[in-house]
């Protein structure tokens, strides 16, 4: 594709999602003459950068350039050379970098500075690297899924793009789970909000939206696990932690220094009489669930209703798309089907967690062990977060749709971010040009 003439005027955009556990590069394309239409932008490539998230490069910033090379070279390959100079590149860093910034603004700035210098060396139109806020992450995720589901379009279609799409224009709520934070974003029934911090107003395609959003820092699946370990080791009698969230027979040595490295475990930090401890899995869903619930403070709420930790949460409304790690984990566990009830999910989790580690390794040969070992915890955490954290019930569970992709594009904040920064979501409904919405004639 490198130098072939394009049959129509196609534009491209690149967004790098610098997450806490890894970085992914997304390439989007759209027909230039339709860039204000809804649903015309789609993802053509995802490239996962090898290695950890950029915040882990704080002590080796000189390696950041080489770290990004493979995926940036892939972008150079996928996007026609004639388009390189006009292709915008954006990098948004999320909770991993928010945590680093909490520890040291100077170190976070240094990492971003090196990232910017590295990305400026490519022939694209680099537009900057920044740490996006939790509110932005929630809002852009909400925009992405509703854009892809066609919820902003004023035209009713006689066909359905995806199985759970209805022809009504009610937007979907967005549930996003990362490694270091989790976001919940939706349009509540009641337009007035008790917490202005959680309120966003948008005008998109001629319609006003009053949106609730909150990002829970330290409640992504990886940081939640660190929190749980730090909490549980406080009461361990020796350097062995019998952990119900890992399979029977699983063993792993953890350095106490690694445990207390993150700001997320500060509230549990104490002087321990050992430098290392060993996790020994006992695989008990019920006990794991109980341990996870202790991470959510539900005893204090200064509003009419809260999620946890005193954060306002209005009554849940409508359907929700649950993506990123919500999807990856539930998909691995084979629990994404609309037909699987919450009770069935709990039952399956009990069974899964109790399976011996050696059996799990054999059954799932080829699944990376680091991830494989944590699915029991992650699945339990997801259930706890959705049910006790966000107050979904057995009945409202059926309103949660676990989504990986919508029409070939990953659900996540990156598309919404690019649409916003390239001004591709107009406030007003664009005037329809002749034939622009018709099928081919």
């Amino acid at each position: 594709t490198q130098n072939k003439a394009l049959p129509e005027n196609i534009k491209y955009g690149i967004v790098l999602d610098a997450g806490s556990s890894h970085t992914s590069l997304y390439i989007y394309k759209w027909p230039a003459e339709k860039e204000n239409d809804t649903g015309v932008v789609h993802q053509v490539e995802e490239c996962r950068v090898k290695g950890p998230g950029i915040s882990k490069y704080v002590q080796k910033v000189n390696e950041i350039g080489i770290y990004l090379t493979d995926c940036m070279e892939r972008a150079r390959e996928v996007i026609p050379r004639s388009q390189h100079q006009e292709t915008p590149v954006y990098l948004g860093a999320t909770a991993g970098m928010r945590l680093l910034r909490m520890e040291s603004e100077e170190l976070a700035d240094r990492v971003l500075d090196v990232v910017e210098r590295s990305l400026s060396n490519y022939p694209f139109d680099f537009q900057g690297a920044r740490i996006i806020t939790g509110q932005e992450e929630g809002a852009y995720g909400w925009i992405t899924i509703n854009y892809l589901l066609g919820k902003f379009s004023q035209k009713t279609r006689w066909f359905s793009i995806v199985p759970y799409e209805t022809n009504n224009q009610e937007t979907f709520g967005a549930l996003d789970l990362g490694g270091a934070s989790t976001q919940i974003t939706f349009v509540p029934q009641n337009q007035t909000t008790e917490s202005p911090d959680n309120a966003l107003q948008f005008r998109l395609y001629g319609k006003d939206y009053n949106v609730y959003t909150h990002s829970f820092l330290c409640y992504g699946k990886d940081q939640a696990l660190w929190q749980k370990l730090a909490k549980d080791i406080q009461v361990a009698s020796n350097e062995i932690l019998r952990d119900p969230c890992f399979h029977p027979g699983y063993k792993k040595v953890v350095n106490v220094s690694d445990l207390y490295k993150t700001p997320c475990t500060k509230r549990f930090e104490m002087t321990l009489p050992f430098q290392q401890f060993e996790i020994q899995g006992i695989g008990n869903y019920q006990q794991c669930h109980q341990s996870v619930l202790e991470l959510f403070n539900t005893s204090y709420c200064p509003y009419s209703q809260c999620a946890f930790n005193g954060i306002f949460l209005p009554p849940l409304q409508g359907d929700f798309g649950a993506f990123s790690a919500f999807y990856f984990v539930m998909n691995f566990l084979n629990l994404t089907s609309e037909k699987v009830s919450q009770e069935k999910v709990t039952e399956m989790m009990k069974k899964f967690c109790s399976q011996p580690w050696e059996e799990i390794k054999t059954s799932y040969a080829g699944v990376k062990e680091k991830y494989l070992s944590e699915y029991c915890f992650s699945g339990t955490y997801i259930l706890s977060l959705l049910l006790q954290g966000y107050h979904f019930t057995a009945d409202s569970w059926e309103h949660i749709h676990f989504i990986g992709k919508i029409q070939g594009s990953d659900a996540g904040w990156t598309l919404g971010y690019m649409l916003n920064l390239t001004n591709m979501i107009p406030a007003e409904q664009p005037l329809s040009t002749p034939l622009s919405h018709s099928t081919y004639v």
Epitope: E45, C47, R48, K50, D70, R74, R76, E77, K368
Partner: antibody
Amino acid sequence: QVQLKETGPGLVQPTQTLSITCTVSGFSLTSYFTQWVRQTPGKGLEWMGFIRSGGSTQYNSAFKSRLSISRDTSKNQVFLKMNSLKTEDTGVYYCARDRPDYHDGTYGVLDVWGQGASVTVSS
Amino acid sequence: DIRMTQSPASLSASLGETVNIECLASEDIDSDLAWYQKKPGKSPQLLIYNGNALQNGVPSRFSGSGSGTHFSLKINSLQSEDVATYFCQQYINYPYTFGGGTKLELR
């Protein structure tokens, strides 16, 4: 079926330049990376560098100043050139295929290797 | 550079025995580790990638495990054709690096 075949000079004088050609069949150079690895008596297996499907290169900094990798896609050939040879460069030079999985972030796995080109650096 | 240390450097085992080879990385490499088998005069063959994924066509008696810094290659029920040198390789960071090899022979 997938094959890679290295052809080299066998004997090279010290200070001279080594040139090896890797001819591939059964796959396209524009879909795979082509890696170079050598095995020397002193250092065992050493990764040297590679050329990506798009044509850009990555080198091991231990060789960077004297190594260059290029290709001719019309002939299905990849070329390794290394100058300023020393006796320690004596060994077997392999080209190998690397199937990049961008979605998974897996690249650097050498799934098919050539039979190797034996190189002796001696005067 | 990431150092890959293999142990033992050599070992002898009897037919039908189970063999374990260890590979230790000098820093966390996640699961970005491959195992290769090399017979004298032949080119290396890929056995395992991503720490534990079996390459197509490789007998199921070979298995890999581990993540982070500790990895192992296990050969169940050793066969005569398994006599070879085994190498591990990390591919998380440039330069990619190999272990020094483990020479396996029959007792």
